[in-house]
Structure formats: C-alpha cells, structure tokens
C-alpha cells in the first residue's frame, strides 16, 4: 500500500521571501528504493486553473521547472518528498500537488500554500495645517499581504491603566497596492492635547494574518505635547 500525507489542515502559510518546505510524506509497506520511484510536484495558481509542473524526480535524474526547486534525495530515502522552494514570492501561492509513483502504485496529495508579508509600522506627527493644541498622529503600515488588516488606537491613562480603544477622531485611509503586490495603509488619530492628561500613552495597534501578536507603536503625551517612541518589536510570523 502506498500513501501520501501532506500538511495537516491542508494549508501551509509561509512568509514572503522565505525558503519554504512544502511537506509531503510517503508511507509505503516496504523500504523505499529511490532509483525505482518517481516524484512530481505540480502547482495551480490562485488566479488561473491551469496546473504547472514545478519539479520532477525520477531515479537517477531530477529537474526543476521553477528555479531552485528541489526534493532532497537523502530525505526521500526515509519517505520525505517535501519540496523546497527558496525565496518564495506572493504569486507562487496556490495549490501544490505531490504525486508519488512506486511502480505500479501511485499516490498523491494536495496542499494550499498561502504567502504572507508582515507589515512594518511607524508613527508620524503631522502638525501642518492643524489648529493650536491640535495634533494629527499618523500610523503607517507598509509592505503587508494579504490586504486585510485591522488598525486600532488605544490609550492608557494613569487613572485607567488598562488600554481603552479610541473610536472618535480616527480615520483609516484606503489600502494602497505597491508594485511588488504588497499593501500600505495609514490610520490617523486627531488629538486635542489641551483636553488630554499629560502622561497618557497612546498606541497604534496593527493586527494582520502574518503576525502572531499585534504590532504596537506608542507615544506619550507630555507637557511638551508629545513624545514619540520607537515601534515595539514583536514576533512576526515564522
């Protein structure tokens, strides 16, 4: 009996530009002889339905139809036909099919590959054209994929140390598509500093599919109106 097992759940998520390994494990009742077996990997794009050959391994020969694509002969010996794709790009997302032939048997499995890009976030203060005691803080998120993103603003005061979401005077602009396929978006918070307590901490909170934990950038309102801090580092998807 010949069986192929792909990633549990049928979906693999990988960061943009990563060297991704798309899993495919072979289960066979006898020890594998790689000189008498074949592995073919196919890819079907999200945008069109045509299947394309990515990599082929037959006994004493292997061929990559996508530059750098490889199945390890040393791992194949122990039943691992996983495909390594260095420098994965957004357009390479889609359905991957692993087809294994141990004559006369054939088995296959498919997996969906999602490619994500983590946003970079930065805070800017825009005082141009603003009234006295009025400030506009901009939270720019750039280079993310997919397009869906959630940006919120929170504040913490000495009186209320738990973060409170701000819903008034927040405007989030449209997402803009970059040349490389990633997206940018800016969210603005308008503040009247005369009505706010010095020492209040404001945070721009970015949530995205590529992030394990939200990306937070903060500033503290001081007597001198504002003090922008560096974006706090968080674990990106890996």
């Amino acid at each position: 009996d010949l069986k192929v097992e792909m990633m549990a759940g049928g979906t693999q998520i990988t960061p943009l530009n990563d060297n991704v390994t798309i899993f495919c494990n072979i289960f066979y009742s006898q020890p594998l002889n790689i000189t008498s077996m074949g592995i073919t990997w196919f890819w079907k794009s999200l945008t069109f339905d045509k299947e394309v050959k990515v990599f082929e391994f037959f006994g004493d020969h292997q061929e990559a139809f996508r530059p750098g694509a490889i199945v390890s002969p040393w791992r194949l010996k122990s039943g691992d036909a996983s495909l390594r794709l260095p420098g994965i790009q957004l357009e390479e997302a889609g359905e991957y099919r692993c087809e294994v032939v141990v004559t006369p048997l054939k088995a296959q499995g498919t997996v969906q590959l999602e490619v994500v890009a983590s946003p970079a976030s930065r805070l800017l203060l825009d005082q141009v054209g603003m009234k006295e005691n009025e400030d506009k803080y901009m939270c720019e998120s750039s280079g993310f994929y997919p397009e869906a993103i959630n940006i919120t603003w929170e504040k913490q005061t000495q009186k209320f140390p738990h973060p409170i979401e701000i819903s008034e005077d927040v405007i989030t602009g449209p997402t803009i598509k970059n040349m490389d396929g990633t997206f940018n978006v800016t969210s603005c918070l308008k503040l009247n500093s005369s009505q706010e307590d010095p020492g209040t901490v404001y945070q721009c909170v970015v949530r995205h599919a590529s992030l394990h934990t939200p990306l937070r950038s903060n500033f503290t309102l001081t007597a001198a109106r504002h003090s922008l801090s560096e974006t706090e580092k968080t674990d990106n998807f890996s």
Epitope: D60, Q62, I70, W74, G79
Partner: antibody, heavy 120, light 111 residues
Framework: EVQLVQSGAEVKKPGASVKVSCKAS????????MDWVRQAPGQGLEWIGD????????LYNQKFRGRVTLTVDTSISTAYMELSRLRSDDTAVYYC?????????????WGQGTTVTVSS | DIVLTQSPDSLAVSLGERATINCKAS??????????MNWYQQKPGQPPKLLIY???TLHSGIPDRFSGSGSGTDFTLTISSLQAEDVAVYYC?????????FGQGTKLEIK
Amino acid sequence: EVQLVQSGAEVKKPGASVKVSCKASGYTFTDYNMDWVRQAPGQGLEWIGDINPNNGGTLYNQKFRGRVTLTVDTSISTAYMELSRLRSDDTAVYYCARSEVFYGNYADYWGQGTTVTVSS
Amino acid sequence: DIVLTQSPDSLAVSLGERATINCKASQSVDYDGDSYMNWYQQKPGQPPKLLIYAASTLHSGIPDRFSGSGSGTDFTLTISSLQAEDVAVYYCQQSKEDPRTFGQGTKLEIK
C-alpha cells in the same frame, strides 16, 4: 550562530544502553538532518546513521541496525542517539552533526563529541 | 558499501609548500552531474571540520589555500601553501550511497 551541544561523558557496562543528546540552536532545526558519527580511540570516522527532524525518518548503517535508535524532539530542537547491548568495541567518541540535505549532502557543523566508555 | 582509500596514509610537507591528498572510491560517487565527495579536517581532541563539499566547493570560512578536485572515483584535496595550523588528519567522505563512508584518514605533518 549554529551550535550543537552534546551531553556529557558516559561509562557503561557491557550489555547496557547509552543515550546521547544533542541540543541544536542557531538555525531552523527541521531544515537539516542530524547525522551521528563515531570515532574509536586512535581510529577513523564511522557513520552510524541520520534522522530527518521533519518526519522522524531514519537511515541507519546496517552495521548498527537493531542496536541503534535515533530520535528527535522538535519542540526543544534536540536529537538523541541510543545504542543498546553495548560491547567493549563501542568505546568511542560519538558526534552529532548537522547535515545539509537539499543542496548536496555534507555535515557542516559538529557537536563537541560525547565520550562513551564500555568497561566491565 | 563504497570503500574510500586515501593516499598517502601520512604526509610531511615544508611550510609554504603544496600538500596533496588523494581519495579513490571503489565505485563512482557521481549522481546527476554532481560528485558527492566531501573533505574534513580533524585536529587532536576536536570534532571534524568541513573543508570541501561536492568535490570542489569550499565551505564558508575556509581559507582559499584549500581546494578540491575530481569526479567519478578519483578525488584530490590540495593545500597550496601549507601553514602551521594545517597540521591535522584529513578525511574524505562519500555521501552518494548509504552507508556514508569515510576514508581511513591522512595525517599531515610539517617537514
């Protein structure tokens, strides 16, 4: 920085078993296989086998088959080599080594070695 | 099993001179256009250190006085200008077939 840190020296009696650990850091554990190689005093190098942390698949040198067991714990990036039914000629330094498997096959980083002495 | 035979067993070379170590395989270690022969250096009390892989590719951080050549069954490790720190035992290893096998080693000394 890639590091492989092995467990300490062991003294065992003939017939006993020994389990050597190899803690990996500084790289993605599942991207490389782990080789195990031994070296008897004053002798050359002998390949014991390797393990693929991706699926736990193992390849053993026929000479050790039935006596050696290679395992991994991916949650702590650690590989293990257990050798049973020890004999005096198993006295050696045992090495783990990170093994590239996609673009060639070679051991590019090695542990410091674990001395196993089998003596009655 | 593929048997690797190194020659010579030991070698004494003057500082600054060329050192050459040979490795002969009992069968070809070539596969799909590549040669699966690696070279390691081992100093006393230390683990082996990778010098050359795929017959001729220099591992990162290894000085370029080390070079490898050959294909099929005959391979050579060359040190173009011997330095004092090159005193060690050198091993060839094939990774085409299991079990992966090593040569018996060549001890390199200074004359």
